[in-house]
Interface confidence: medium
C-alpha cells in the first residue's frame, strides 16, 4: 500500500487486516447544499445512437438498483429518422464502485466492489474486415 | 435508524455516528476485467462524436486516477470526415463513487464521495429554441 505519515489525529485501527478494512463516512446522503452535480439529459432519446434503460436489482448492494443502457438499434439514426446500418450503435461502458453487504445482512459492514455498467451509446464507424 | 436482525458474526459498531460511519473491506472484488478505458475500446476514435481522454490524478482519493472524456468537436463527424455543426457532440456524464481520505493523510479513514465524470461522447440532435 501507500506509505502515509501517521497523524496523531487519525482514527486508530487494531484490525489485523488493516489497511484492508477501513472506516468510511457515508455522508454522501447529505444533500443539504446545492453543490451536487446537476443531472443532465434526455440524450438517451436525442442521440443518433439512442438507448433504453434496463433495471438490474440486487438488494445486498448499494445502489440496489442499477439502470443499464441498452442501445435501441444496431445501426445509427439518420436525420430522416431511418436507421443507417452502415454505422453501429455501441454502448459506452464505465466501471463504478458499489458497496456490498458482507457478511450478508450485516447492517454496518460492507465490501467495495467494482462493476462495469453501460452508461449510454455512441455511434461508431464499423471495423470492416477484408477477406484476402 | 433501521431495525435489522443482529447477526452474531457482524462487526459491532460503537461509533456514535453509526450508521453514518461503517466498516468497508477494500479487498475490492472486481466483477470485470479491463480498467484502462484506452485499452477497453477504440470507440473514442471511431465515434461520430469522438473524444479525448484526460487523466485526473488525486493521491488522496481512491481510485486515484480517473480518466475524463472531452468531446473533440462541437458538431459530429460525417462519413466524409468533415464536421456537421447541425448536430452536437455532447458528453455522457456519470456519477461515480470514490473514497476520499478524511482526515487527509489518514490511512484508514475515508469519506464516500460522489463525483461526476464524463465517460464518452454521443451525437445528438440540438434543441432549437424558437423565438416568438
Amino acid at each position: 500500500g501507500i506509505a502515509i505519515p501517521r497523524n496523531s489525529g487519525c482514527p486508530n485501527s487494531e484490525d489485523k487486516n488493516f489497511p484492508r478494512t477501513v472506516m468510511v463516512n457515508l455522508n454522501i446522503h447529505n444533500r443539504n447544499t446545492s453543490t451536487n452535480p446537476k443531472r443532465s439529459s434526455d440524450y438517451y432519446n436525442r442521440s443518433t445512437s439512442p438507448w433504453n434503460l434496463h433495471r438490474n436489482e440486487d438488494p445486498e448492494r448499494y445502489p440496489s438498483v442499477i439502470w443499464e443502457a441498452k442501445c435501441r438499434h444496431l445501426g445509427c439514426v439518420k436525420a430522416d429518422g431511418n436507421v443507417d446500418y452502415h454505422m453501429n450503435s455501441v454502448p459506452i461502458q464505465q466501471e463504478i464502485l458499489v458497496l456490498r453487504r458482507e457478511p450478508r445482512h450485516c447492517p454496518n459492514s460492507f465490501r467495495l466492489e467494482k462493476i462495469l455498467v453501460s452508461v449510454g451509446c455512441t455511434c461508431v464507424t464499423p471495423i470492416v474486415h477484408h477477406v484476402a | 435508524g433501521i431495525a435489522i436482525p443482529r447477526n452474531s458474526g457482524c462487526p459491532n459498531s460503537e461509533d456514535k455516528n453509526f450508521p453514518r460511519t461503517v466498516m468497508v473491506n477494500l479487498n475490492i472484488h472486481n466483477r470485470n476485467t479491463s480498467t484502462n478505458p484506452k485499452r477497453s475500446s477504440d470507440y473514442y476514435n471511431r465515434s461520430t462524436s469522438p473524444w479525448n481522454l484526460h487523466r485526473n490524478e488525486d493521491p488522496e482519493r481512491y481510485p486515484s486516477v480517473i480518466w475524463e472524456a472531452k468531446c473533440r468537436h462541437l458538431g459530429c463527424v460525417k462519413a466524409d470526415g468533415n464536421v456537421d455543426y447541425h448536430m452536437n457532440s455532447v458528453p455522457i456524464q456519470q456519477e461515480i463513487l470514490v473514497l476520499r481520505r478524511e482526515p487527509r493523510h489518514c490511512p484508514n479513514s475515508f469519506r464516500l464521495e460522489k463525483i461526476l465524470v464524463s465517460v464518452g461522447c454521443t451525437c445528438v440532435t440540438p434543441i432549437v429554441h424558437h423565438v416568438a
Epitope: 457515508l26 454522501i28 446522503h29 447529505n30 444533500r31 443539504n32 447544499t33 446545492s34 451536487n36 452535480p37 446537476k38 443531472r39 443532465s40 439529459s41 434526455d42 438517451y44 434503460l53 433495471r55 436489482e57 438488494p59 445486498e60 448499494y62 445502489p63 440496489s64 438498483v65 442499477i66 439502470w67 463504478i96 447492517p107 455498467v117 452508461v119 449510454g120 | 435508524g1 433501521i2 435489522i4 450508521p19 453514518r20 461503517v22 455522457i92 456524464q93 456519470q94 456519477e95 463513487l97 460522489k114 465517460v119
Partner: antibody, heavy 126, light 107 residues
Framework: EVQLVQSGAEVKKPGESVKISCKAS????????ISWVRQAPGQGLEWMGG????????DYAQKFQGRVTITADESTTTAYMELSGLTSDDTAVYYC???????????????????WGQGTTVTVSS | EIVLTQSPDFQSVTPKEKVTITCRAS??????LHWYQQKPDQSPKLLIK???HSISGVPSRFSGSGSGTDFTLTINGLEAEDAATYYC?????????FGQGTKVDIK
C-alpha cells in the same frame, strides 16, 4: 410493483404523539427509501423526512427536527413515522412515499416519489 | 430552502385543449424536478420525473420540459379524467419542497 399500505386514521389530543406505519410489499425493501409527506386540509404537500433503508440513514426537515422520528423494520418491511408534541396545526393527511435510490441514467440515488401510500388522517383536537 | 412557484394557481379548460403549467425554482436545480397529479381524496401520482422523463403507464399526452430554474408540464389534449391538482417537486437539495399546486378543472 411496490405497494404501500398505511395504518388507519388517528384522533389525538394536543401534546400527545402519533405513530403511523407504512407496510411495503412487492420489490425488495432494501432497494429504496421511504419519505413522509403531509397535507393539511385544503393545503399543499410538505416533506417531513425520510429513511434510506440500505444504510438506515434518516434525514429530517428542519421544521420537524426533534419532533419526528422515522424508523424501519426490515423483517416486517414496515416503515414508521412518529410525531410528538402534537398541536392542531398537525391535523393533516400523512403519506408515506417510496424514494427509489436507484443508479439511474448515470446518477446515484434517484429522489422522485414513485409510489405513495393511501394516506393516514390524523386529527388533533382537545 | 428552495422555493417552487407554480403558475397559474387555477385553470379552467375545455376538453381537447392544451394545458401548460409552469414551475419556477428560487435557484438552479438542474433537472431535479418531478411532477405529480392529485385527484380529490386520492394520493399523489408521479407523472414526470427529472423534468422530462416519462413514467410507464402515464398517458403520452403528459410531457415535461425545462432545466435550471424554469420548468413546464404540458397536457396535450386535456381529457375529463385529467381534472386534478398538479404539483411540482424538487429533490436537488434537502428539504424536498413542492410547489403550491395548480388546480385544473374542466369547463
Amino acid at each position: 410493483e411496490v405497494q404501500l399500505v398505511q395504518s388507519g386514521a388517528e384522533v389525538k389530543k394536543p401534546g400527545e404523539s402519533v405513530k403511523i406505519s407504512c407496510k411495503a410489499s412487492g420489490g425488495s425493501f432494501r432497494s429504496y427509501g421511504i419519505s413522509w409527506v403531509r397535507q393539511a386540509p385544503g393545503q399543499g404537500l410538505e416533506w417531513m423526512g425520510g429513511i434510506t433503508h440500505f444504510f438506515g440513514i434518516t434525514d429530517y426537515a428542519q421544521k420537524f427536527q426533534g419532533r419526528v422520528t422515522i424508523t424501519a423494520d426490515e423483517s416486517t418491511t414496515t416503515a414508521y413515522m412518529e410525531l410528538s408534541g402534537l398541536t392542531s396545526d398537525d391535523t393533516a393527511v400523512y403519506y408515506c412515499a417510496r424514494e427509489p435510490n436507484d443508479f439511474w441514467n448515470g446518477y446515484y440515488d434517484t429522489h422522485d416519489f414513485d409510489s405513495w401510500g393511501q394516506g393516514t388522517t390524523v386529527t388533533v383536537s382537545s | 430552502e428552495i422555493v417552487l412557484t407554480q403558475s397559474p394557481d387555477f385553470q379552467s379548460v375545455t376538453p381537447k385543449e392544451k394545458v401548460t403549467i409552469t414551475c419556477r425554482a428560487s435557484q438552479n436545480i438542474g433537472s431535479e424536478l418531478h411532477w405529480y397529479q392529485q385527484k380529490p381524496d386520492q394520493s399523489p401520482k408521479l407523472l414526470i420525473k427529472y423534468a422530462s422523463h416519462s413514467i410507464s403507464g402515464v398517458p403520452s399526452r403528459f410531457s415535461g420540459s425545462g432545466s435550471g430554474t424554469d420548468f413546464t408540464l404540458t397536457i396535450n389534449g386535456l381529457e375529463a379524467e385529467d381534472a386534478a391538482t398538479y404539483y411540482c417537486h424538487q429533490s436537488d437539495t434537502l428539504p424536498h419542497t413542492f410547489g403550491q399546486g395548480t388546480k385544473v378543472d374542466i369547463k
